[in-house]
């Protein structure tokens, strides 16, 4: 017997759908990278899980209390009517910590988006044409950022006049995909929690 597949209904916390798509897209891209870059260190055993957001955002610290505290009073009752233009937070009474958590997620996505777009521009110049970033993954990052919509200034794509170092770009791609997948898992957990609460 086939089990019914849960499809998100329009009234559902909108970011959950985006975060699930993100996790799926990153996982698919990582699998593709592992297969394509077989002669590069691209398995989780071979590389360090380095986080480009380290010391720049505080997603884990900001989002962990949300899961640990089912009781809103544990957040020092610091409730604010935090309204953004984005669909994820619109018209929701949002705790200070939740706002902090979601804005930190937004900053993470922004940083990874810049890195991935810069890398893709380099990979498109590779004569071997070995691997490119999945446009679907880039689109899903964009969709989730739009849903969060924290109106922060746009970060210009890093442009470089240097000749691209394709060897370095491919190793870096593997490391960042692994790190981003871990972050996507965290984001999905947060969104699942917010949807349930």
């Amino acid at each position: 017997r086939n089990l019914p597949v849960a499809t998100p209904d329009p009234g559902m916390f909108p970011c959950l759908h985006h975060s699930q798509n993100l996790l799926r897209a990153v996982s698919n891209m990582l699998q593709k990278a592992r297969q394509t870059l077989e002669f590069y260190p691209c398995t989780s055993e071979e590389i360090d899980h380095e986080d480009i957001t380290k010391d720049k955002t505080s997603t884990v610290e900001a989002c962990l209390p949300l899961e640990l505290t089912k009781n809103e009073s544990c957040l020092n009752s610091r409730e604010t009517s935090f309204i953004t233009n984005g669909s994820c937070l619109a018209s929701r009474k949002t705790s200070f910590m939740m706002a902090l958590c979601l804005s930190s997620i937004y900053e993470d996505l922004k940083m990874y988006q810049v890195e991935f777009k810069t890398m893709n521009a380099k990979l498109l110049m590779d004569p071997k044409r070995q691997i490119f970033l999945d446009q679907n993954m880039l689109a899903v990052i964009d969709e989730l950022m739009q849903a969060l919509n924290f109106n922060s200034e746009t970060v210009p794509q890093k442009s470089s006049l240097e000749e691209p170092d394709f060897y370095k770009t491919k190793i870096k791609l593997c490391i960042l995909l692994h790190a981003f997948r871990i972050r996507a898992v965290t984001i999905d957990r947060v969104m699942s929690y917010l949807n349930a609460s």
Partner: nanobody, 114 residues
Framework: EVQLVESGGGFAQPGGSLRLSCAAS????????MAWYRQAPGKERELVTS???????NYADSVKGRFTISRENAKSTVYLQMDSLKPEDTGVYYC????????WGQGTQVTVSS
């Protein structure tokens, strides 16, 4: 204050060897993939080899089988053993993180010539 200091460069004949060292601040080194880069005269700086915190290594095709990267985590130091040197290995060698590069050090000059 100085975060990355490379040393060990010098003059070598083709087929010779050199061992480079890079002393890093613990904050730069700890938990990060470290790498050796080189900048040949008139060329862009390029990645030569990298080593993860757990010791996983990778080498550019041009140095595979000749160069060996290693690290001593307790000393926040990364090494590059260069054997069977070729004239095309000439350049300034730098170490840095692979991701989120720190400020570049002065580098150490390697010249391979007969």
């Amino acid at each position: 204050e100085v975060q990355l200091v490379e040393s060990g460069g010098g003059f070598a004949q083709p087929g010779g060897s050199l061992r480079l060292s890079c002393a890093a601040s613990a904050s730069i080194f700890s938990g990060y993939t470290m790498a050796w880069y080189r900048q040949a005269p008139g060329k862009e700086r390029e990645l030569v080899t990298s080593i993860s915190h757990r010791g996983g290594t990778n080498y550019a095709d041009s140095v595979k089988g000749r160069f060996t990267i290693s690290r001593e985590n307790a000393k926040s130091t990364v090494y590059l053993q260069m054997d069977s040197l070729k004239p095309e290995d000439t350049g300034v060698y730098y170490c840095n993180r692979l991701i989120n590069e720190a400020s570049w050090g002065q580098g150490t000059q390697v010249t391979v010539s007969s």
